[in-house]
């Protein structure tokens, strides 16, 4: 499946479509971010391109989503990893892949994992390889909370708008 | 886990349950489709059986969901694939499995991938095999947009109401 | 990724945060449960710890979520499984892992699978191993319906608040 995306301008046009009013009118905080495909060895979230958006108070700061108002939110993220043939050298040990959505809150001074997915892949046994991870759930969040991600295996990410993303919306 | 489903009539009864009013009353567009288990080499979405439904304007046309009103929607889909050894050779090539939710819009004349998941399985290495793929995210959609799916590995789908599905709801 | 969680008391404080009003005010039934990490060979859902909660009518009884009011709900669950080599033989049998969300309703006298994910892992071939499964979808539910889970491979669960969870919210 080709990682086809819209050009930023086409997507921008779509998002700014005149009179594109929300179904059943009440705006609610929502955000959908995509991994920046130009950054190969890091995972930088972008909101100003393709299908990505920030709405009704959500903002992106220091690669984290800032929760605009207290309430229950559904938070989700996906990553896709891949590897080429003969990428491992003198090992048959597995590659550890993991993706986690974390919460940093004023209420406790550390990152709390909200959503974690993990996988061991065996590049020496199976190559090329591809693996997708998705997770999402509802959480009670407080205004000012920061939602971020941590990923093990970043060099193996398949960075396209439809494969690597992170979002949240108020319920 | 047996792929138990309701008979269409029982499910129909459930959906038309007298006075089954929605929690907190406001109807919002929502749809949940299931893969037709009677079609083994294609993925045809059905809304009139088991737990599937179309509500408040969503319709199904040409195997695509038609977006009834502009706004932000959470769109999701799952597939489960399985296989037996179809070749006794342990050196058989990998099988590429993929599932994608695509958007076709009047705004640009091609299918835009919204959600993509991919996997390589090695039937000769591991048989029988089973693999599940799920994804979902929030997107800004416009009235008349068409949501469809594309799947690589359709002959390997495990078609039951709880394993292969596609849906969306307005936020 | 360490399976860090909040202490129950810290989480409790967070949930009872004074004036923590919901974004855009209308409460809607929502629940997020986590697998009890103290129970190693069963999957017991807990609502009174870490990020878990029951809101606006949802209750937990006999390890099932009770639907408080009729309507459309998004239902989701995740599990993560892991294993170490317990046999070095590459010919060891596969392990069947599965996770299912089931509905028990007054309308029909059996458990109906709503969401199913499945996987075969080959411990002798690939060790250690890790596998994540997630699924979620929208369903029309009736007041009094019971949502529960069934899991194959419970001894292999990685029980932490961010890896094993089950939830639902009204749309």
């Amino acid at each position: 499946l080709p990682g086809v995306g819209l050009t930023p301008s086409a997507a921008q046009t779509a998002r700014q479509h005149p009179k594109m009013h929300l179904a059943h009118s009440t705006l609610k905080p929502a955000a959908h971010l995509i991994g920046d495909p130009s950054k190969q060895n890091s995972l930088l979230w972008r909101a100003n391109t393709d299908r990505a958006f920030l709405q009704d108070g959500f903002s992106l700061s220091n690669n984290s989503l800032l929760v605009p108002t207290s309430g229950i939110y559904f938070v989700y993220s996906q990553v896709v990893f891949s590897g080429k043939a003969y990428s491992p050298k003198a090992t048959s040990s597995p590659l550890y892949l993991a993706h986690e959505v974390q919460l940093f809150s004023s209420q406790y001074p550390f990152h709390v994992p909200l959503l974690s997915s993990q996988k061991m892949v065996y590049p020496g046994l199976q190559e090329p390889w591809l693996h997708s991870m998705y997770h999402g759930a509802a959480f009670q969040l407080t205004q000012g909370d920061q939602l971020s991600t941590h990923t093990d295996g970043i060099p193996h990410l398949v960075l396209s708008p439809s494969t690597v993303f992170f979002g949240a919306f108020a319920l | 886990l047996p792929g138990v489903g309701l008979t269409p009539s029982a499910a129909q009864t459930a959906r038309q349950h007298p006075k089954m009013h929605l929690a907190h009353s406001t109807l919002k567009p929502a749809a949940h489709l299931i893969g037709d288990p009677s079609k083994q080499n294609s993925l045809l979405w059905r809304a009139n059986t088991d737990r599937a439904f179309l509500q408040d304007g969503f319709s199904l046309s040409n195997n695509s969901l038609l977006v009834p009103t502009s706004g932000i929607y959470f769109v999701y889909s799952q597939v489960v694939f399985s296989g037996k050894a179809y070749s006794p050779k342990a050196t058989s090539s990998p099988l590429y499995l993929a599932h994608e939710v695509q958007l076709f819009s009047s705004q640009y004349p091609f299918h835009v991938p919204l959600l993509s998941s991919q996997k390589m399985v090695y039937p000769g290495l591991q048989e029988p095999w089973l693999h599940s793929m799920y994804h979902g995210a929030a997107f800004q959609l416009t009235q008349g947009d068409q949501l469809s799916t594309h799947t690589d590995g359709i002959p390997h789908l495990v078609l039951s109401p709880s394993t292969v599905f596609f849906g969306a709801f307005a936020l | 990724l360490p399976g860090v969680g909040l202490t129950p008391s810290a989480a409790q404080t967070a949930r009872q945060h004074p004036k923590m009003h919901l974004a855009h005010s209308t409460l809607k039934p929502a629940a997020h449960l986590i697998g009890d990490p103290s129970k190693q060979n069963s999957l017991l859902w807990r609502a009174n710890t870490d990020r878990a909660f029951l809101q606006d009518g949802f209750s937990l009884s006999n390890n099932s979520l009770l639907v408080p009011t009729s309507g459309i709900y998004f239902v989701y669950s995740q599990v993560v499984f892991s294993g170490k080599a317990y046999s070095p033989k590459a010919t060891s049998s596969p392990l069947y892992l599965a996770h299912e969300v089931q509905l028990f309703s007054s309308q029909y006298p059996f458990h109906v699978p709503l969401l199913s994910s499945q996987k075969m892992v080959y411990p002798g071939l690939q060790e250690p191993w890790l596998h994540s499964m997630y699924h979620g979808a929208a369903f029309q539910l009736t007041q009094g319906d019971q949502l529960s889970t069934h899991t194959d491979g419970i001894p292999h669960l990685v029980l932490s608040p961010s890896t094993v969870f089950f939830g639902a919210f009204a749309l």
């Epitope: 550890y96 020496g124 199976q126 | 342990a90 050196t91 | -």
Partner: antibody, heavy 114, light 113 residues
Amino acid sequence: EVQLVESGGGLVQPGGSLRLSCAASGYTFSSYWIEWVRQAPGKGLEWVGEISPGSGSTNYNEEFKGRATFSADNSKNTAYLQMNSLRAEDTAVYYCADGYHGYWGQGTLVTVSS
Amino acid sequence: DIQMTQSPSSLSASVGDRVTITCKSSQSLLYSANQKNFLAWYQQKPGKAPKLLIYWASTRDSGVPSRFSGSGSGTDFTLTISSLQPEDFATYYCQQYYSYPRTFGQGTKVEIK
């Protein structure tokens, strides 16, 4: 530039313990296993075991099980080898390596002697 | 454990010579599913860390001169230096990574004649 740098070696009394460090730089550390290999003076290479820093999974050579413990701190991109109940025959240069990329550290000498 | 046996344990050669080192494993290192041999060759000079030369029995690591080649399958493997250079005088080790524990051959020391 990729580097693995071992430290923590030195003179230890028989029966004593020590902790060796392996600091990685120039690549993402957490997904790739760190192996520990040792070489006694004038002898060949001996595999001690390995750790997956991200997952915490370990594999030990049975000969070292109970005396060697692997750990890792992902925030510091550093893996550790703790060796207990040291004997004269544990005198060796200890190397850490990342077999996935083929990187090796320069080694650190541990001498067990009274 | 898989035993790895190298021969010879040492050899003397001159610059320009063709040198062959063999390595035998006590069980097959060939993984039938992908037809790959889980064997590596290392070069070690005095006071230095081992350097990876060959992996998957025959794949040269980046930056390794083409005069080094690996061959063999199953239980019998060979490292060949087609034309020995002054910087090639060192000790060479084979290693299997097919199963745990990983094991090395005892080494072959290549000395100047």
